[in-house]
């Protein structure tokens, strides 16, 4: 038999649920390391107290072609109020270093897990 | 000239489904994403979501995730919300807003006055 | 979910200065929530003052600026005008969702 029943839509993920999904796969990024995150590519160094959530996403979605972290990309388009394209860098972001990707994941991780911890859902 | 044009007043019973339009023009509607804010008679602004055109991925708030649809039609640069299951409270007008990093919220359309009445 | 509180009404004398807040219930506002500030008048749309914390809007007067004081947004207005009589909002963006201010009443008087 196939139910053709209309299911009300899931509500909204709170903020904290939201926050801890991220972290949940950027621990799985970092574990799952196996070869060089993105074969080494090499990304803006964000400031991880302003405006983070669109930065992130602003440094990271310069990366193509790398599939490991297509979700985290995804996930970050959803945390930003404003689209991002490749090659959009908002004035919160500064471009001074360039680092790994594989850095600026274990940097975002240690950052958003402080704020789980603290309770910053914000 | 950017600009925004919405669909005209609507008058509906309670239980009704209202549609209302989002006409942009002086842009790209996949370029941005777009925000819908209700405001009841006397009441403050409250936000209902947002679409991206580009995918039709959504974001709802809490208050309107089961009764708010939000499309987008990128071949004619138009923004829809669709608010099923209306009862009184829902007479508002209804804004859409195009929201980016320079400038968000800084273009709105004239606003949509939808009221609710048997 | 989050309240996002402002100060039903101020008044401010012409040339005055006044400073309108916008409290998170889920504690101090940082600059991930992206606030933003609009004035509205009567059978008016909104219109955008500030965006992400402290940038002016092209059309804002200098006279306006955004800025976080003692964890909540601000908006503080400098040298009151007669035209700036209107009510003001704050949004603060919440990982996945806005919220609006309660909204300020501004008088210039």
């Known amino acids: 038999l196939t139910c053709l029943g209309g299911f009300a839509s899931p509500g909204p993920v709170p903020p904290s649920t939201a926050l801890r999904e991220l972290i949940e796969e950027l621990v799985n990024i970092t574990q799952n390391q196996k070869a060089p995150l993105c074969n080494g590519s090499m990304v803006w160094s964000i400031n991880l107290t302003a405006g983070m959530y669109c930065a992130a996403l602003e440094s990271l979605i310069n990366v193509s072609g790398c599939s490991a972290i297509e979700k985290t990309q995804r996930m970050l388009s959803g945390f930003c109020p404003h689209k991002v394209s490749a090659g959009q860098f908002s004035s919160l972001h500064v471009r001074d270093t360039k680092i790994e990707v594989a850095q600026f994941v274990k940097d975002l991780l240690l950052h958003l897990k402080k704020l789980f911890r603290e309770g910053q859902f914000n | 000239e950017v600009q925004l044009v919405q669909s005209g007043a609507e008058v509906l019973k309670p239980g009704a489904t209202v549609l209302i339009s989002c006409k942009v023009s002086?842009?790209?509607?996949?370029?941005?994403?777009m925000h819908w804010v209700q405001q009841a008679p006397g009441k403050g602004l409250e936000w209902m979501g947002r679409?991206?055109?580009?995918?039709?991925?959504?974001k709802y708030a809490p208050k309107f995730h089961d009764r708010v649809t939000l499309t987008a039609d990128t071949s004619t640069d138009t923004a829809y919300m669709e608010l099923s299951s209306l009862r009184s409270e829902d007479t508002a007008v209804y804004y859409c807003?195009?929201?980016?990093?320079?400038?968000?919220?800084?273009?709105w359309g004239q606003g949509t006055l939808v009221t609710v009445s048997s | 979910q989050a309240v996002v509180t402002q100060e039903p009404s101020l008044t401010v004398s012409p040339g005055g200065t006044v400073t309108l807040t916008c409290r998170s219930s889920?504690?101090?506002?940082?600059?991930?929530?992206?606030a933003n500030w609009f004035q509205q008048k009567p059978g008016q749309a909104p219109r955008t003052l500030i965006y992400?914390?402290?940038n002016r809007a092209p059309w804002t007067p200098a006279r306006f600026s955004g800025s976080l004081l003692g964890g909540k947004a601000a908006l503080t207005l400098s040298g009151a005008q007669p035209e700036d009589e209107a009510e003001y909002y704050c949004?603060?963006?919440?990982?996945?969702?806005?919220?609006f201010g309660t909204g300020t009443k501004v008088t210039v008087l």
């Open positions: 807003t195009r929201y980016d990093y320079y400038g968000p919220f800084a273009y």
């Open positions: 002086g842009f790209t509607i996949k370029d941005y994403y």
């Open positions: 679409i991206d055109p580009e995918d039709g991925e959504t």
């Open positions: 889920t504690g101090a506002v940082t600059t991930s929530n992206y």
């Open positions: 992400g914390t402290n």
């Open positions: 949004a603060l963006w919440y990982i996945n969702h806005f919220i």
